[in-house]
Interface confidence: low
């Protein structure tokens, strides 16, 4: 019993003055608490608590369930306790069958004894099965049996508390150990889509999946750089013992442009945190942006092929695409396809395949595309390079020799005189007149050039060469001169 020092509050005293008391079932329990400032008796066993404001606690007919700790408290908050065992051969254990252990922590099998004098107080496996080899425990008759450092492998382990009574083993009711796993890794988080593009008024909904060993994992959707609480809905599942999954769905029923931004799904447990983000872009209306993959001015040689290629971004999805030339729509020779098979793809490719182009097929080729909100177009100017063709070569009545040639780019015409019958003409002759005939005509056709020289300058037999050339090639025509006396007898043009 505590000693009393004058002037200093002391704990109450209890009669009988011992720390433990053993009574037989059916006997009376009579406990007296002596203290000038008595407040209450408290009885505790397992999770049950009872209070009594009388300074004498009397239980006329004791039962096994009256086993427990009786504490007397005074007004100074000081207390004293006695532990009472009510020995009942028919009920050796008081039991709270709930048994939950946190991994790596100790947990108590709550089977306190009603008789402290029984022997070999220990744990046994159900149906004679042995306990796990590494399971260590410490028995305490007043509290139960403490399992040290619970392992995840002990989950759903079936146990009995056991004692020996009169040479026989007596088992308690069975306990099933449920292990609450410790977090040994950060949660695994994933998001249904990494980015979203929406028009104003459309619904934004994104789901974050959080996986961990137990439901104690914390998760939330956050808007980056904002403290606003977001509205989420949850679904959760236990797939087996240590495989928990939660789906947190964030919804904005009618998205606005200022809802655009980065949303983070954040999860943490006692081990650490993990996060994943998704980007929302809300536009006030749809759009189409076209990007030519080649120069919009194209030069191609006669008879060659060319591919006109565009990439374009379209949101919402493109509905109509066409290629047009000279007010005619192509029904074939082109293809249109998404740049990626990704669900959130907004980029597309369109290709027009022009084969064996003729000189007459230059011009403006236009790609048009539209969706439910906008139209867009891009034009390619295609120039077909052609070797010059000499259209006419004549002696005019005024004595002029005239050569007319067509090609693209614009041909140049040079004149040469060859004495005698040679056709390797070297001496150049300056033209009297050079004209480009169709500069005011269509911009993509062949360009026609006319050049003239004065034939009176030639005094000897010979050949005059008209040579038309450009970057693609050259073509020549020839005029033959023959003199009889002082007269030019004849001029024979030939190529």
């Amino acid at each position: 019993q505590p000693s009393v020092s004058p002037g200093e509050p002391s704990p109450p005293s209890i009669h009988p003055g011992k720390s433990d008391l053993i009574v037989r079932v059916g006997d009376e329990i009579r406990l007296l608490c002596t203290d000038p400032g008595f407040v209450k008796w408290t009885f505790e066993i397992l999770d049950e608590t009872n209070e009594n404001k009388q300074n004498e606690w009397i239980t006329e007919k004791a039962e096994a369930t009256n086993t427990g700790k009786y504490t007397c408290t005074n007004k100074h908050g000081l207390s004293n306790s006695i532990y009472v065992f009510v020995r009942d051969p028919a009920k050796l254990f008081l039991v709270d069958r709930s048994l939950y252990g946190k991994e790596d922590n100790d947990t108590l099998v709550r089977c306190p004894l009603t008789d402290p004098e029984v022997t070999n107080y220990s744990l046994k496996g159900c149906q004679g099965k042995p306990l796990p080899k590494d399971l260590r425990f410490i028995p305490d008759p007043k509290a139960g049996i403490m399992i040290k450092s619970v392992k995840r492998a002990y989950h759903r382990l079936c146990l009995h508390c056991s004692v020996d009574q009169e040479g026989k083993s007596v088992l308690s009711e069975k306990f099933i150990l449920k292990v609450r796993p410790a977090f040994k890794a950060v949660p695994v988080v994933s998001v249904s889509k990494a980015s979203y593009l929406l028009r104003e008024g459309e619904e934004f909904t994104v789901t974050c999946t959080i996986k961990d060993v137990s439901s104690s994992v914390y998760s939330t959707w956050k808007r980056e750089n904002s403290q606003t609480k977001l509205q989420e809905k949850y679904n959760s599942w236990h797939h087996g013992d240590f495989n928990y999954e939660r789906q947190a769905t964030l919804t904005i029923s009618s998205a606005r442009v200022n809802d655009s931004g980065v949303f983070m799904c954040y999860a943490n447990n006692t081990f650490g945190s993990a996060n994943v983000t998704t980007t929302l872009e809300v536009v006030d209306k749809g759009f189409i942006n076209i990007f030519p993959m080649i120069n919009t001015t194209v030069f191609v040689n006669d008879g060659e092929n060319v591919d006109l290629i565009v990439e374009y971004e379209a949101f919402p999805k493109p509905e109509h695409q066409q290629w047009i030339y000279m007010n005619r729509t192509f029904t074939d020779k082109w293809e249109d396809y998404p740049k990626s098979e990704n669900e959130s793809n907004i980029r597309y490719v369109s290709e027009l395949h022009l084969t064996r182009l003729k000189g007459t097929e230059g011009g403006t080729y236009t790609f048009l595309v539209s969706n439910s909100d906008v139209n867009a177009a891009i034009a390619f100017n295609v120039y077909v390079n052609t070797k010059p063709e000499i259209l006419t070569y004549d002696r005019l009545v005024n004595g002029m020799l005239q050569c007319v040639a067509a090609g693209f780019p614009e041909p140049t015409i040079d004149w040469y005189f060859c004495p005698g019958t040679e056709q390797r003409c070297s001496a150049s002759v300056l033209p009297v007149d050079v004209q480009t005939l169709n500069s005011s005509g269509p911009p993509f056709g062949k360009l026609v050039v006319q050049s003239s020289i004065d034939s009176s300058a030639f005094k000897h037999n010979g050949t005059v060469e008209c040579k038309a050339y450009n970057d693609v090639g050259k073509t020549s025509a020839y005029f033959n001169f023959a003199f009889k006396g002082n007269n030019k007898e004849q001029i024979h043009p030939h190529t």
């Epitope: 049950e48 009872n50 709270d96 609450r180 599942w237």
Partner: antibody, heavy 123, light 107 residues
């Protein structure tokens, strides 16, 4: 003995607020989850949510998330269910119940029930 | 959320009859199922927890069985005080849903 005692019946108008209580005794209040269950007239039981008074860990049914708030005062062994703006459809009997000790509140069962609080919302 | 479907929704029986009520879960819930009895104007009362464990003080004529998705509550010999509504509840994962109830009436 172990018991839960709920506050008395309440008659309210739509839009008003209300907080009903559930007081536990005869056991260690902080060691057990306390759940709330709704029963509309002539209908079945609906699980609303649950709180662990020891640390105020709270879980809600998606149907009731944002509609009600569950809280607890552990020093006075009392759990609460509150509405900030009542609707006529909130008219029902509300029960609190102790959830037998469980790993994260998943196991065990409602072993002790309060007597129920009738909430009537009418204009 | 896990759905619980109780059948039948109501039944008529006589004193002494054997009565069986079933509860089916939309996904596996191991043995995490409880059964309750509710009489008019009263709070529900726990009968069975862990699918088959009889709550203290509940008469032994009540028994529960099943695991996974299919569960049964059996009253071996119906007594006058057993006429009531019976509910199952899953306690495997949030939200902790109830079945729709089975009303046992006097034939």
């Amino acid at each position: 003995q172990v018991q839960l005692v709920q506050s008395g019946a309440a008659v309210k108008k739509p839009g008003e607020s209300l907080k009903i209580s559930c007081k536990g005794s005869g056991y260690r209040f902080t060691s057990y989850w306390i759940g709330w269950v709704r029963q509309m007239p002539g209908k079945g039981l609906e699980w609303m949510g649950i709180i662990y008074p020891g640390d105020s860990d709270t879980r809600y049914s998606p149907s009731f998330q944002g509609q009600v708030t569950i809280s607890a005062g552990k020093s006075i062994s009392t759990a609460y269910l509150q509405w900030s703006s009542l609707k006529a459809s909130d008219t029902a009997m509300y029960y609190c119940a102790r959830h037998g000790r469980g790993y994260n509140g998943y196991e065990g069962a409602f072993d002790i029930w309060g007597q129920g609080t009738m909430v009537t919302v009418s204009s | 959320a896990i759905q619980l479907t109780q059948s039948p929704s109501s039944l008529s029986a006589s004193v002494g009859d054997r009565v069986t009520i079933t509860c089916r879960a939309s996904q596996g819930i191991s043995s995490a199922l409880a059964w309750y009895q509710q009489k008019p104007g009263k709070a529900p009362k726990l009968l069975i927890y862990d699918a088959s464990s009889l709550e203290s003080g509940v008469p032994s004529r009540f028994s529960g069985s099943g695991s996974g998705t299919d569960f049964t509550l059996t009253i071996s010999s119906l007594q006058p005080e057993d006429f009531a509504t019976y509910y199952c509840q899953q306690v495997n994962s949030y939200p902790l849903t109830f079945g729709g109830g089975t009303k046992v009436e006097i034939k």
